[in-house]
């Protein structure tokens, strides 16, 4: 049975139970490009953060360039959420618990500011993909995932013809794409700059707040 | 959903100055490149200006040396200072944003630039 993020009594400055993530966040100074707003406080290592900037990384053998080559004004957005994912000890209200042979937790719903997704599907318009959800259904043979049968590689707009259905279907409902905009403290940010600090503690506050979790 | 929300605009003697404005709402306005453009009655769409979200320029021939792009990415703003205007510079102008490598689809209502001589 699945475990709500009730059940969790940690919902503040957590890390997910999952493949890479450290058990504790903590200071990480070395942490890569992208992943460098977090170096304050991390789920991920210096590492960790150096291999998911790489084409096909060893993180998960996932390749983005399934479908040729991807711009790298889209790519840059799958990196940013992977730094999310891997580095944010600010998820926790979100945190569910998985049956799965790679990690035992999972993030769900998590409130994307809008701003974020819309930016996301707008730089992948031009670029391709197969699936709709990346979650499941590729061909793994020969280690790195492949097109299925019978998937044929389109325009993103094609597999999702709107924001929402990127940012919420891509990740199995990873996100769900928040009415709120960024700055309000209401909505968690993938992209920010880390000189103001890291504006997702604040909302990771309210929600926890709003769940009746110390 | 994106908007832009272009003003400023109005009528100025020949040699005069004008600064247009652009407001962007809806993407994450830092990341992109940002332009101005201009459409005189019975001619095409054309770029003026352009600047990287790095803030790199780029000016068509007939402007260089007159107008000033620039941005406040705090205010998600983009600016056009127009100088020793000129009656051929009489357009409705527009801005748009730039995502990866296209301008985008998304429109203002723009904003009536008249130049009288």
């Known amino acids: 049975t699945m475990c709500s993020a009730q059940d969790r009594t940690d919902l503040l400055n957590v890390c997910m139970d999952a493949k890479h993530h450290k058990t504790k966040p903590g200071p990480e100074d070395k942490l890569h490009d992208q992943c460098s707003p977090w170096k304050k406080n991390a789920c991920c290592t210096a590492s960790t953060s150096q291999e998911l900037h790489k084409d096909t990384s060893r993180l998960y053998n996932f390749n983005w360039d399934h479908c040729g080559k991807m711009e790298p004004a889209c790519k840059r957005h799958f990196i940013q959420d992977t730094c999310l994912y891997e580095c944010s000890p600010n998820l926790g209200p979100w945190i569910q618990q998985v049956n799965q042979s790679w990690r035992k937790e999972r993030f769900l719903d998590v409130p994307l500011c809008k701003e974020d997704c819309q930016q996301w599907w707008e730089d992948c318009h031009t670029s391709h993909t197969c699936k709709s959800n990346w979650h499941r259904g590729w061909d793994w043979t020969s280690g790195v995932n492949k097109c299925p049968a019978g998937a044929l590689c389109r325009t993103f707009e094609s597999y999702f013809p709107t924001p929402a259905a990127l940012c919420e279907g891509l990740w199995s409902h990873s996100y769900k794409v928040s009415n709120y905009s960024r700055g309000s403290g209401r909505c968690i940010q993938m992209w920010f700059d880390s000189a103001q600090g890291n504006p997702n503690e604040e909302v990771a506050r309210f929600y926890a707040a709003a769940m009746h979790v110390n | 959903q994106v908007q832009l929300q272009e003003s400023g605009g109005g009528l100025v003697q020949a040699g005069g100055s004008l600064r247009v404005s652009c407001a962007a709402s809806?993407?994450?306005?830092?990341?992109?490149?940002m332009g101005w453009f201009r459409q005189a009655p019975g001619k095409q769409r054309e770029l003026v200006a352009s600047?990287?979200?790095?803030?790199?320029?780029k000016y068509a021939d007939s402007v260089k040396g007159r107008f000033t792009i620039s941005r406040d990415n705090a205010k998600n703003t983009v600016y056009l200072q127009m100088n020793s205007l000129k009656p051929e510079d009489t357009a409705v102008y527009y801005c748009?944003?730039?995502?990866?490598?296209?301008?985008?689809?998304?429109w203002g209502q723009g904003t009536q630039v008249t130049v009288s001589s």
């Open positions: 748009n944003i730039q995502f990866g490598s296209r301008w985008s689809t998304y």
């Open positions: 600047i990287t979200s790095g803030g790199s320029t």
């Open positions: 809806g993407i994450i306005f830092s990341m992109n490149g």
